[in-house]
Structures are given as structure tokens and as C-alpha cells.
């Protein structure tokens, strides 16, 4: 027979979500106004590149990243539209009420959807850990508990530790990662006998999978120079992330080369690997002076993203239930900390260079910032694992995890796949 | 070399508005950040706004949230300050000034290279 | 918000003096602070960036010094041309960029 959405979902999603998409029109309306003072037509084009770039990273990067399951590639797709759709809409009105709203409504500016895209994206790379095991009212939940953990947190550390957006946004990384491994492990995890195959790859979804990743390899520079107030900072940022995933490339597929036994290339690996220079430098990428330290950098993280996914997967899917080919999560919660570190040491070598005596109390700051981030992560992400674990959302059965027929419907398919 | 040359000053009642504009020459105006910084008489130096350099991101004094509006025209190679709802205490010599950005190990310093000569705001009934 | 407070705040010395202006922050911004120049009715201009990087065309007589909370403007033999208001700036949060008081130097 063929599988339907259970009709309590039917009745749930549609009113949870349109609901919801009610109130933040009306919230719109009572709170938001476009920003007046576009004076320079030229310049807002320009300005709007960058957030289109962010949009095709999003929608297409991470959208067919996560796609590479055999029976689970339209939702992935399909679902990452939707999170991304909710998410920067209750973003760029987070973002207005926690920073401008004393002042009246909320002004809304090219810069607040580029904010509001990377604030979504945060979702999209936390999700990773859990598609295919929740259904499109759940990820409404953890749309909302996410933008809104992110955007605090993101506020916390700009007024505690005097970040500007660059630096408080560049969390995003560990936070993401955390918050998505934490949702993961409150969730379901065994898969029952019989479902195995639908955790797999597939040539055509992973064929797709690897289009999502080198979407985001060509866009990562825009990701990691979108915040940046200068001309140079953003030069900076997009030569050094450049030559930093073109390092991890190489190194990648190298890599996972060499990590295999007869010497094949692992598709997985590759996915995630070539990404991982982008996210090593993110935060520092303005900051590294010359290209070979980005490139050494994009070396040292290929490496780490390719020994990551031979190793961790074994322990991932045994503790929270993440399959083999969903490694962004733990991927990124490495690569994440270890742009942290870099920039710890950039932190050093300037309050050395300033001949300040106050080394220990700054690097305890950026551990303080950093460790902030990764506690905010794995209470709200077990917060929301909790929220999702609740019978309302009739989350799909074990045997219906990674099935796209439980959420589509396939007119030519009568019955199974 | 580098001119930055205010004006739109003047004598106005509180509560109404005034638009300051600052014309720029001699650089390439569209790379750098704008900022406006005004003098009360006989007081010290105000940071009241900034605008990034492609006019994507604005920020404000608190003194000036959601009555002062910045903006930009880089095709004309123009700053401008849109002030509404004037008080008493909005009285000052506004100077633009160029913001430059130069790398630290851990972060950019910014400083302001140039200013303009200042134009006079006066609010008074 | 990041608070600087300079001392003295106004001081009297003669030409060819030594001249020392501090300024305090109320948290540290390790060495991102400036220091500027204004004489009355100009423009302030800018002498020194990053705490001690002296601006081309800024005689040597001035330089800059310190690093987290506590900074200092010498001005080593004071000339009649010195003879100005001094304000000292951070730049290490975001905006808002906070100015010192300003510190005016007058003739003895």
C-alpha cells in the first residue's frame, strides 16, 4: 500500500505552519519598514550579489548536500527550501527586535536578509543530522528554537566580548554542529531490520549531493566575507578562503585516496572534505596576512575532515544515530574549533605585538566566547531534541525514517519505490 | 588630494528636520566608510553615525537612534544625514570624516584619515 | 559601551617642554586607540593610530604609547603649534566609537 502522511500530520502541519506564517505577516506588518535612504542604485545591486550568492549557497549548496540518501533525496531538497523560507523571516525579525527595536520598528536592509540567510543557514547545516528521521512540523520547531538561540547568542557575545557581525557570525560553524549532533542524539536512533538500504547513497542523489557541494565551494568566499565592513577585509577574506578550499580539494580527494584501502576515492569523503578549508579559515580568513598560511590551513583541514569521516561515522552512528553519510555535523564541530584555535593564536600574536601584558586574560576571553557558543548550542539543541520528542508532531515511525513516499506523492509509483 | 566639504547647516526650530551633505573628491569614495562626528560648543568630539562603504550597514548613537538617518550616494560620490524630530541638544558642528581600515593580528583598526571643515547646526525656538 | 577618560583635562606648559596625556579605557582594547588634534575652530586632524603609529607628516616630537587599558600621548619639546585640544579614540569594539573628553593645552 502506498504510505500517506498520517492524517494527524495532515490536520497538524498545515495549521502549524500557516499559522505561523499568519503571525510573522502580521508581526511584519506592525514592526518592519523598509529602509528609506537607497540613494545609489549602482550600490544596490552590488549589495545584493553577495546576499544572492548566500541564497544559492543555501538553497542549492546545502539543499542538494543533503540529498545524497537513495530514498530520501526529494526531501532533503524540498525541506531545506522550507527551513530556509521559515528561517529568514523570524531571523531578520529576531535580528530587528534584539538590536534596533528600542528605537521604533525594525528597518529593513539588504544587510538584514544577508544576516537573516546566514543565521538560516545555521538549520541547514545543524539538520544534517537529523533528515530523514522528523517530518516538516518538527523542523518548523527546530527552525524557530534555532534562529532564535543563534540570534541571542549572537548578541550575547557582540555585547559582552565587543564583536563586530564577522566574528560573532563565524560561531556558526561549531554552533551549528553542536546544536545538530545535540538534536540527534535525543531522537529515536535505532534503525529497524529492513530499513539499512534507505540510509545509503545512491549514484544519482550522491551525483546531486556533490552538485550541493561544489555550489558551496564556489560561493564559500562570499559566505565568509558577506559581514566584512571593508574593501580590504573582504579582498582579504575571499583570496584566503579561496586558496583555502582550493587547498582541501586537492587534499580531500587525495586523501581519501589514501585512505582507503585499494586506494578509491570515498564519495562522502569528498562532499564534505572539499568544504573544509572554507570553514577552517572562516573566522581568521581576514586576518591571515599571506595566502600560503590560508593554503596550509586548507591542507591541515582537509586532513582533518578526511581522518574525521574514516573514523567518526563507526561512533556517530552508534551514539546518536547519524548515518555514515551525514557528516557535516561532526565535520564542522571539528573544523569549527579549529578555526577558533587559529584565531586564539592570532588573539596571542597581536596582544604580544601590542606588548600587552594581558595575554591570559584575552585568550580567556575568545575560550570564554568560544565555549559560550558550544554550551548555548547543546542546551538548546537538547531543548529542542526534548520539544520533538513530544507525541504531538507524530514524528514518522522508525521504518518510515529515510523515505521520501512517507512526505511525496509519486503518481506513477502504486506502491513502494 | 582628499576634500571632504560639508554643508546643509543652519538655523532651525526643534522638531523639525534638516539634511546635512557631505561632498567628497580627490579619492575613490565608494571604497571607504563614512561617518558623521559633531561638536556641541565648547564640548568634546560626538560619534554620531557610520555607513559602510557599499551603504549595506548603518549604525547610530544611541543620542540619535531612529531620528538621524545616514545614507550614501556613491555614484555622486555624496554623504548624507537626514535629521528629524531636532532637539536643543542636536546642536553642533557636524564634520564628515573617512574611515581607514588597517589590519591587526586580531582584528581590523579603524581611524579617520580626513574630516570636512564642519557645517553648523542650530536648534533653537 | 567602551568608556575612555583622559587626564589631565586641560593642562598649561610652556615651548619646549615634555608633555605627557594619558588615557584610561574602562575595559581593555588591546592597542586600538588613536589619537587626534584639534585647534580651535578647524577640524580635528589625526596624529597617532594603533596607540604609537605616528601619521606621515606628524612630527616626531609626538609619539604614542601603551597597550590595553592604559595609554599615553608624549609630546616631547612642546612647540607653539601644540598648542591645541587632544582627543583619544577606540576603535577596538564595533560602534559606538567613543572619544576621550579631550584634553586642551594651553600656553603657561
Known amino acids: 500500500m502506498s504510505s500517506k502522511y498520517p492524517r494527524s500530520v495532515r490536520r497538524c502541519l498545515p495549521l502549524w505552519a500557516l499559522t505561523l506564517e499568519a503571525a510573522l505577516i502580521l508581526l511584519f506588518y506592525f514592526f518592519t519598514h523598509y529602509d528609506a535612504s537607497l540613494e545609489d542604485q549602482k550600490g544596490l545591486v552590488a549589495s545584493y550579489q553577495v546576499g544572492q550568492d548566500l541564497t544559492v549557497m543555501a538553497a542549492i549548496g546545502l539543499g542538494f548536500l543533503t540529498s545524497s540518501f537513495r530514498r530520501h533525496s526529494w526531501s532533503s531538497v524540498a525541506f531545506n527550501l522550507f527551513m530556509l523560507a521559515l528561517g529568514v523571516q523570524w531571523a531578520i525579525l529576531l535580528d530587528g527586535f534584539l538590536s534596533q527595536f528600542p528605537s521604533g520598528k525594525v528597518v529593513i536592509t539588504l544587510f538584514s536578509i544577508r544576516l537573516a540567510t546566514m543565521s538560516a543557514l545555521s538549520v541547514l547545516i545543524s539538520v544534517d543530522a537529523v533528515l530523514g528521521k522528523v517530518n516538516l512540523a518538527q523542523l518548523v520547531v527546530m527552525v524557530l528554537v534555532e534562529v532564535t538561540a543563534l540570534g541571542n547568542l549572537r548578541m550575547v557575545i557582540s555585547n559582552i566580548f565587543n564583536t563586530d557581525y564577522h566574528m560573532n557570525m563565524m560561531h556558526i560553524y561549531v554552533f551549528a554542529a553542536y546544536f545538530g549532533l545535540s538534536v540527534a542524539w535525543c531522537l529515536p536512533k535505532p534503525l529497524p531490520e529492513g530499513t539499512e538500504d534507505k540510509d545509503q547513497t545512491a549514484t544519482i542523489p550522491s551525483l546531486s549531493a556533490m552538485l550541493g557541494a561544489l555550489f558551496l565551494w564556489m560561493f564559500w568566499p562570499s559566505f565568509n566575507s558577506a559581514l566584512l565592513r571593508s574593501p580590504i577585509e573582504r579582498k582579504n577574506a575571499v583570496f584566503n578562503t579561496y586558496y583555502a578550499v582550493a587547498v582541501s580539494v586537492v587534499t580531500a580527494i587525495s586523501g581519501s585516496s589514501l585512505a582507503h584501502p585499494q586506494g578509491k576515492i570515498s564519495k562522502t569523503y569528498v562532499h564534505s572534505a572539499v568544504l573544509a578549508g572554507g570553514v577552517a579559515v572562516g573566522t581568521s580568513c581576514h586576518l591571515i596576512p599571506s595566502p600560503w598560511l590560508a593554503m596550509v590551513l586548507g591542507l591541515v583541514a582537509g586532513l582533518i575532515s578526511v581522518g574525521g569521516a574514516k573514523y567518526l561515522p563507526g561512533c556517530c552512528n552508534r551514539v546518536l544515530g547519524i548515518p555514515h553519510s551525514s557528516i557535516m555535523g561532526y565535520n564542522f564541530s571539528l573544523l569549527g574549533l579549529l578555526g577558533e584555535i587559529i584565531y586564539i593564536v592570532l588573539l596571542v600574536l597581536d596582544t604580544v605585538g601590542a606588548g600587552n601584558g594581558m595575554i591570559g586574560f584575552q585568550v580567556l576571553l575568545s575560550i570564554g566566547e568560544l565555549s559560550l557558543a558550544i554550551v548555548i548550542a547543546l542546551m538548546s539543541g537538547l531543548l529542542t531534541g526534548l520539544l520533538l520528542n513530544l507525541k504531538i508532531w507524530k514524528a514518522p515511525h522508525e521504518a518510515k525514517y529515510f523515505d521520501d513516499q512517507v512526505f511525496w506523492k509519486f503518481p506513477h509509483l502504486a506502491v513502494g519505490f | 588630494q582628499v576634500q571632504l566639504v560639508e554643508s546643509g547647516g543652519g538655523v532651525v526650530q526643534p522638531g523639525t528636520s534638516l539634511r546635512l551633505s557631505c561632498a567628497a573628491s580627490?579619492?575613490?569614495?565608494?571604497?571607504?566608510?563614512m561617518h558623521w562626528v559633531r561638536q556641541a560648543p565648547g564640548k568634546g568630539l560626538e560619534w554620531v553615525a557610520y555607513i559602510w562603504y557599499d551603504g549595506s550597514n548603518k549604525y547610530y548613537a544611541d543620542s540619535v537612534k531612529g531620528r538621524f538617518t545616514i545614507s550614501r550616494d556613491n555614484s555622486k560620490s555624496t554623504l548624507n544625514l537626514q535629521m528629524n524630530s531636532l532637539r536643543a541638544e542636536d546642536t553642533a558642528v557636524y564634520y564628515c570624516?573617512?574611515?581607514?581600515?588597517?589590519?591587526?593580528?586580531?582584528?581590523?583598526?579603524?581611524?579617520?584619515?580626513?574630516w570636512g571643515q564642519g557645517t553648523l547646526v542650530t536648534v533653537s525656538s | 559601551d567602551i568608556q575612555l577618560t583622559q587626564s589631565p583635562s586641560s593642562l598649561s606648559a610652556s615651548v619646549g617642554d615634555r608633555v605627557t596625556i594619558t588615557c584610561r579605557a574602562s575595559q581593555s582594547i588591546s592597542s586600538y586607540l588613536n589619537w587626534y588634534q584639534q585647534k580651535p575652530g578647524k577640524a580635528p586632524k589625526l596624529l597617532i593610530s594603533a596607540a604609537s603609529s605616528l601619521q606621515s607628516g606628524v612630527p616626531s616630537r609626538f609619539s604614542g604609547s601603551g597597550s590595553g587599558t592604559d595609554f599615553t600621548l608624549t609630546i616631547s619639546s612642546l612647540q607653539r603649534e601644540d598648542y591645541a585640544t587632544y582627543y583619544c579614540?577606540?576603535?577596538?569594539?564595533?560602534?559606538?566609537?567613543?572619544f576621550g573628553q579631550g584634553t586642551k593645552l594651553e600656553i603657561k
Open positions: 579614540q577606540q576603535s577596538y569594539s564595533t560602534p559606538p566609537y567613543t
Open positions: 570624516a573617512r574611515e581607514i581600515a588597517s589590519r591587526g593580528y586580531s582584528r581590523y583598526l579603524y581611524y579617520f584619515d580626513s
Open positions: 580627490g579619492f575613490t569614495f565608494r571604497t571607504y566608510g
